[in-house]
Amino acid sequence: VPRWRQQWSGPGTTKRFPETVLARCVKYTEIHPEMRHVDCQSVWDAFKGAFISKHPCNITEEDYQPLMKLGTQTVPCNKILLWSRIKDLAHQFTQVQRDMFTLEDTLLGYLADDLTWCGEFNTSKINYQSCPDWRKDCSNNPVSVFWKTVSRRFAEAACDVVHVMLNGSRSKIFDKNSTFGSVEVHNLQPEKVQTLEAWVIHGGREDSRDLCQDPTIKELESIISKRNIQFSCKNIYRPDKFLQCVKNPEDSSCTSEI
């Protein structure tokens, strides 16, 4: 008799998920000397232990604690770049500006970036058919809880000036429901963080508006100010030029506004 399987609304676990996590771990630890001590098999075992045999709508931050412990990593707290809805540009930036870090430049973020995973209650199987969707099924699913956990820890670690890259092409440049808006903003520590500086990335070639005056940015400023953290905002009118100038700051065209 075929066993009944829960059909979720979201895509299933990424193909070759165990191999991918293990391979990413090995690659990461090879090029980050400070993480060479990490045993990638133990990391995979802890990752697996967080969701295997558990109901995929009943995952808690506690489930991920063994993985968090193994993946503990110190990044310079004053070199943190947060982002919302503009991941690729944030990653292009830290690929050039090597002393700054997004969450996905840390081991745990790197391991899980772009992947989906879930298990099934009371079986050791990984579900490759479907996984819970955050909106349509449940919020306490393995992927959402993972990102909430690592994002909270990442924000808590930040100090001095924290930068956030925001997508100026979105209707809500700052979205209270994004991971940045719902988790990271509220876990910046006022006793450590002096300023949150937003970089609003423009999408249109001829877009010369001051998007720092956008109502959602004003809402972000209000939330941050109430937490006793200063707020500043910059328009990045030309993201392509911005990246070029990060690569070649001495270029004569880089003295003008970007």
């Epitope: 990424t14 991918t20 990413r24 690659k27 690729d88 990653h91 292009q92 690929q95 772009d114 992947l115």
Partner: nanobody, 125 residues
Framework: QLQLQESGPGLVKPSETLSLTCTVS??????????WGWIRQPPGKGLEWIGS???????YYNPSLKSRVTISADTSKNQFSLKLNSVTATDTAEYYC?????????????????WGQGTLVTVSS
């Protein structure tokens, strides 16, 4: 959610050209962060890397297939394509498009971490 989807004819005649396209959704192929590639698996055999492309336009091919392979990208459609000339029955395989991990050159089946579902191509008259 990043997804890759292969498309193209499932049957190709010997000596003709096999053409496949990979459509990427949930991410951009022009971000300069990744290598995108093609891998195949003949029935009952292991995975074989065919080639990779980077958004700079650089392409890298398996030496054993280099003379017959072209990989190209169309960033406006967020697609990359495979052309394999002068096919024979030995080119019958499941063909996969895939993305390499950020920050690493990808030149073997184990170097890729996000995969399409695969499409079976049979070479037969």
């Amino acid at each position: 959610q990043l997804q890759l989807q292969e498309s193209g004819p499932g049957l190709v005649k010997p000596s003709e050209t096999l053409s496949l396209t990979c459509t990427v959704s949930g991410g951009s192929i022009s971000s300069s962060l990744f290598y995108w590639g093609w891998i195949r698996q003949p029935p009952g055999k292991g995975l074989e890397w065919i080639g990779s492309i980077h958004d700079s336009g650089s392409t890298y091919y398996n030496p054993s297939l280099k003379s017959r392979v072209t990989i190209s990208a169309d960033t406006s459609k967020n697609q990359f394509s495979l052309k394999l000339n002068s096919v024979t029955a030995t080119d019958t395989a499941e063909y996969y498009c895939a993305r390499g991990p950020r920050g690493f050159y990808s030149s073997g089946p184990d170097d890729f971490d996000i995969w399409g579902q695969g499409t079976l191509v049979t070479v037969s008259s």
